[in-house]
């Protein structure tokens, strides 16, 4: 039993990190292997991950972390019964992938204007909590090629546009997700869409 | 819940030796690095010494370097500090203290056991 | 070895007065920084890890913050059973080391 592809992990800087690697062949990840992990600097026990199937030779594991400062480096150590198979180490703060924004809602009833908000993924004391830009992603459902990005690079998650941008009468949907320059974090996932019926007064046109 | 019980002290001349004990309850006690700190009468803290989960590693204060070892014994859930060539200046109230895991942070504590050296 | 260095070692105060303690290292700790509160006859009992990471108990009065070399417990509001001494640890490298301890009174 070998590693083909070398553990690679993200974190979510506040709880979670995912670890992702792949067998040289069809392995029940969650019998056969497991991940432990550890803060360098403690002298404890590691910590266990049971590592779940992810295609036919690939596994996934969710490592809890109880807090994320910047200089957190684990170590990882991924065992196959009494085998040591890899060893390697990992540090959270230069892998971030920040959570995906919750509860995306479109406020269709202030004038003309759609004001779309969500909310921030992280807590007011997490460091990501201020740190955060977005991305707004709108399409239409009837007209694939009516796609378009707003980026929101102000601390305010909320987007305010014109309904006229948009075309009146047919319906559109929106995500949102989030991303930090800080950390040079990737992108989160697209938070669930949402869905709404675009229809504005169109001005009357004078002759 | 967890529990830390320091015992052992006492009064010793200078030169003399001494072991304190720390039994632990309501942990694992196996599964975590484990410490000494100790307090000077009417002064600060001071960080005595670690030793891992396994007993394979083990730090010191300089101070203590050499003269202090530590040790523990999983099967007895019991923590050791064995203090050689006591000074005067190892007078103090020592307590054996629980490492977190990347949360929990040096608690609880127990209630110290005091060495007094004096001749 | 990393020397902390707290200021002030001592000041009074009065309920409900917000209360500043500093600690210093004498390099980068990484923020691997925690606080004690110590009353007289007690054993110390853990308030902050990770420079601003509230032990689970203790009342959001407490904070911590800081980065780098500086770092700072804050009391919102001064409660009776606040007044104690504080202790900072850095837990970057051994030999793990405590500040010298700051000693708040009643005014």
């Known amino acids: 039993m070998k590693v083909l592809q070398e553990p690679t992990c993200v974190s979510d800087y506040m709880s979670i990190s995912t670890c992702e690697w792949k067998m040289n062949g069809p392995t029940n990840c969650s019998t056969e292997l497991r991940l432990l992990y550890q803060l360098v600097f403690l002298l404890s026990e590691a910590h266990t991950c049971i590592p779940e199937n992810n295609g036919g030779a690939g596994c996934v594991c969710h490592l809890l972390m109880d807090d994320v400062v910047s200089a957190d480096n684990y170590t990882l150590d991924l065992w196959a019964g009494q085998q040591l198979l890899w060893k390697g180490s990992f540090k959270p703060s230069e892998h971030v992938k920040p959570r995906a924004p919750g509860n995306l809602t479109v406020h269709t009833n202030v004038s003309d204007t759609l004001l779309l908000t969500w909310s921030n993924p992280y807590p007011p004391d997490n460091y990501l909590y201020n740190h955060l830009t977005y991305a707004v992603n709108i399409w239409s459902e009837n007209d694939p090629a009516d796609f378009r990005i707003y980026n929101v690079t102000y601390l305010e998650p909320s987007l305010r546009i014109a309904a006229s941008t948009l075309k009146s009468g047919i319906s559109y949907r929106a995500r949102v997700r989030a991303w930090a320059q800080c950390y040079n974090t990737t992108w989160s996932e697209w938070s669930p869409s949402t869905k709404w019926h675009n229809s504005y007064r169109e001005p009357f046109e004078q002759h | 819940q967890v529990q830390l019980v320091e015992s052992g002290g006492g009064v010793v001349q200078p030169g003399r030796s001494l072991r304190l004990s720390c039994a632990a309850s309501?942990?694992?006690?196996?599964?975590?690095?484990m410490h000494w700190v100790r307090q000077a009468p009417g002064k600060g803290l001071e960080w005595v010494a670690v030793i891992s989960y396994d007993g394979s590693q083990t730090y010191y204060a300089d101070s203590v370097k050499g003269r202090f070892t530590i040790s523990r014994d999983n099967s007895k859930n019991t923590l050791y500090l064995q203090m050689n060539s006591l000074r005067a200046e190892d007078t103090a109230v020592y307590y054996c203290v629980k490492e977190g895991r990347s949360g929990s942070w040096f608690d609880p504590w127990g209630q110290g056991t005091l060495v007094t050296v004096s001749s | 070895d990393i020397q902390m260095t707290q200021s002030p070692s001592s000041l009074s105060a009065s309920v409900g007065d917000r209360v500043t303690i500093t600690c210093r290292a004498s390099?980068?700790?990484?923020?691997?920084l925690a606080w004690f509160q110590q009353k007289p006859g007690k054993a110390p009992k853990s308030l902050i890890y990770?420079?601003?990471s509230l032990q689970s108990g203790v009342p959001s009065r407490f904070s911590g913050s800081g980065s780098g070399t500086d770092f700072t417990l804050t009391i919102s509001s001064l409660q009776p059973e606040d007044f104690a001494t504080y202790y900072c640890q850095q837990y970057n490298s051994h030999p793990w080391t405590f500040g010298q301890g700051t000693k708040v009174e009643i005014k």
């Open positions: 390099q980068a700790i990484n923020n691997y």
């Open positions: 309501g942990f694992t006690f196996r599964s975590y690095g």
């Open positions: 990770a420079t601003s």
